[in-house]
């Protein structure tokens, strides 16, 4: 009778085991073990027992002890079960961002591991078990579907294998996959709201505001604002589930024409975009040209107004004839024209909007000097000792210098309050002098003596 010890062994893959073959007879002709495994007979005194070390056990095996005794040959098998944890435990790759409300399929693949009867695959969210199944097939695959919720944001999903050898007196061997961190998001179907000027003048600044509500998590939203190829650098302010991105936009002559203003919001693996066209225009103020800005009285003056080729101008309220970018008028300069404003108003239509620009020039007319009766009366009669202010206004451009002298030396204090005395009486020669010439006028002052009763 041949016996073997142990009759059943569970050992790690690549491990070794000592197997004792025994026979019930004292002097067996033969005692040995039959196995494809590498083996060594170890030291064991006596004839009816032999110990073998079987090494590098890679798979389940059934070595057989045999003995040949006088009463015949017999055999006994030992059952070697190899255990090993899986070589690969992996969650199938998924995009890290998942929209709320989507069904997410988690797929775990397990390669290797034995004995399969003791191997279980567990899908987890954090520490919560979502699914538990025995490992079947090579590779074993376990799947489960999760409806993505907002509160799943940041949750770790993983796959764990459990090789439970506790019934065999060993331990529970666990292998866990690399975790998959879920990032959930909500990006509304409505495009972002974009507020910006429809038209923008070259070398000016405009403000663009892009906003959107109903985002989650709003802090993860990326906002891209661009005008044509120019990336704008917005200042973003966040609300609970909204944001507002504000940016200044500067345009130059190179940008002239119709440009696309885009606001793109990227969250997770989705984006929403709003497009708007902004017309960049160049519209300098119209040019008011005077033949000469300063002319002498009686000179013929031409006033021209020139604007953008597509503009329509009015000069001093009078539209150009024909309606267009140029207008002009002719006049003979009079003193009344001095300081007269010539205003040109130009109107340009840009993307359906009317843009107005004005330019004003003033005409200076040189005239005079003038001394007339109205402003410089020729005769004054004042009571003696009364308070009087002699008035004499000389006109002209430039304003003339005025001096009134009696006998060439005694001045009449023009514009000053004086007490009328006998000395004031007499004829004064008032002389108004400017670069334009000189005029004189005689002014007589009469002083009335009081009557003594």
């Amino acid at each position: 009778q041949t016996s073997v010890s142990p009759s059943k062994v569970i050992l790690p893959r690549g491990g070794s085991v000592l197997v004792t073959c025994s026979t019930s007879c004292d002097q067996p002709k033969l005692l040995g073990i039959e196995t494809p495994l590498p083996k060594k007979e170890l030291l064991l005194p006596g004839n009816n027992r032999k110990v073998y070390e079987l090494s590098n056990v890679q798979e389940d095996s059934q070595p057989m002890c045999y003995s040949n005794c006088p009463d015949g040959q017999s055999t006994a098998k030992t059952f070697l079960t190899v255990y090993w944890t899986p070589e690969r435990v992996e969650l199938a790759p998924l995009p890290s961002w998942q929209p709320v409300g989507k069904n997410l399929t988690l797929r775990c693949q397990v390669e290797g591991g034995a004995p399969r009867a003791n191997l279980t695959v567990v899908l987890l969210r954090g520490e919560k078990e979502l699914k538990r199944e025995p490992a079947v097939g090579e590779p074993a695959e376990v799947t489960t579907t999760v409806l993505v919720r907002r509160d799943h944001h940041g949750a770790n999903f993983s796959c764990r294998t459990e090789l439970d050898l506790r019934p065999q007196g060993l331990e529970l061997f666990e292998n866990t996959s690399a975790p998959y961190q879920l990032q959930t998001f909500v990006l509304p179907a409505t495009p972002p709201q974009l507020v910006s000027p429809r038209v923008l003048e070259v070398d000016t600044q405009g403000t663009v505001v892009c906003s959107l509500d109903g985002l989650f998590p709003v802090s993860e939203a990326q906002v891209h604002l661009a005008l044509g190829d120019q990336r704008l650098n917005p200042t973003v302010t966040y609300g609970n589930d909204s944001f507002s991105a504000k940016a200044s936009v500067s345009v130059t002559a190179e940008d002239e024409g119709t440009q696309r203003l885009t606001c793109a919001v990227i969250l997770g693996n989705q984006s929403q975009e709003t497009l708007q066209t902004v017309t960049i225009y160049s519209f300098p103020a119209p040019n008011v040209i005077l033949t000469k800005p300063e002319v002498s009285e009686g000179t013929e003056v031409t006033v021209k107004c020139e604007a953008h080729p597509r503009a329509k101008v009015t000069l001093n309220g009078v539209p150009a004839q024909p309606l267009g970018p140029r207008a002009q008028l002719l006049l003979k300069a009079t003193p009344e024209d001095n300081g007269r404003s010539f205003s040109c108003s130009a109107t340009l239509e840009v993307a359906g909007q009317l843009i107005h620009k004005n330019q004003t020039r003033e005409l200076r007319v040189l005239y005079g000097p003038r001394l007339d009766e109205r402003d410089c009366p020729g005769n004054w009669t004042w009571p003696e000792n009364s308070q009087q202010t002699p008035m004499c206004q000389a006109w002209g451009n430039p304003l003339p210098e005025l001096k009134c002298l009696k006998d060439g030396t005694f001045p009449l204090p023009i514009g000053e309050s004086v007490t009328v005395t006998r000395d004031l009486e007499g004829t004064y020669l008032c002389r108004a002098r400017s670069t334009q010439g000189e005029v004189t006028r005689k002014v007589t002052v009469n002083v009335l003596s009081p009557r003594y009763e």
Epitope: L18, K39, K40, E41, L42, L43, L44, P45, G46, N47, V51, E53
Partner: antibody
């Protein structure tokens, strides 16, 4: 440290008796099989005897069977070799040596310094 | 009964590789151990279970065992390696068996 120290060797006449001792220290004596190995002058090593860890099993080389007795006192951490009917060919240095914890592999990892037994008239 | 046969002597130049053989019937089916013994000293285990090195034994000592022959190899032999080397195995009777020993001379 782990140590084995032999004693009791000396000159003895043929047919005489001698008891060798081997004092063990630095390890759990009662867990190991212990051996006696001898070496005749100018010759090689020869296994003499082995005793199991609890003393219940003893093994001898054919050359000493019936004349030598191996024993141990685990309470004293001591191994003995009682040698009777000594012959001139028993003249040798006697070493005690510890067999590794798993005696199945049969190698000796710790040796004493040896004690000389001379059998001569 | 197993008998282990070793060459009585092996010579090697310093730095060269020394190989000491130990032969016996179906020796590869059992484990072989090797001991180094210097004059006047007790043996020291240098290789056990065919090819394993105890702690403290230099890496230049290695062993192999297959078929009927076990071999102790000393690569880059040094003067201090000069000693007697014994192989050892086991059988049911006698229980433990030593080879006759090989004297290694470092030239």
């Amino acid at each position: 440290q782990v140590q084995l120290v032999e004693s009791g060797g000396g000159l003895v006449q043929p047919g005489g008796s001698l008891r060798l001792s081997c004092a063990a220290s630095g390890f759990t004596f009662n867990s190991y099989y212990i051996n006696w190995v001898r070496q005749a002058p100018g010759k090689g090593l020869e296994w003499v005897s082995t005793i199991s860890s609890d003393g219940s099993n003893t093994f001898y080389a054919d050359s000493v069977k019936g004349r030598f007795t191996i024993s141990r006192d685990n309470s004293k951490n001591t191994l003995y070799l009682q040698m009777n009917s000594l012959r001139a060919e028993d003249t040798a240095v006697y070493y005690c040596a510890r067999t590794t914890l798993n005696y199945y592999y049969g190698y000796m990892d710790v040796w004493g310094q040896g004690t000389l037994v001379t059998v001569s008239s | 009964d197993i008998e282990l046969t070793q060459p009585p002597s092996v010579s090697v130049a310093p730095g060269q590789t020394a190989r000491i053989s130990c032969s016996g019937d179906s020796l590869g089916s059992k484990y072989v151990h090797w001991y180094q013994q210097k004059p006047g000293q007790a043996p020291v285990l240098v290789i056990y279970s065919d090819k394993k090195r105890p702690s403290g034994i230099p890496e230049r000592f290695s062993g192999s065992n297959s078929g009927n022959t076990a071999t102790l190899t000393i690569s880059g032999t040094q003067a201090e390696d000069e000693a007697d080397y014994y192989c050892q195995s086991y059988d049911s009777n006698p229980m433990l068996v030593f080879g006759g020993g090989t004297k290694l001379t470092v030239l």
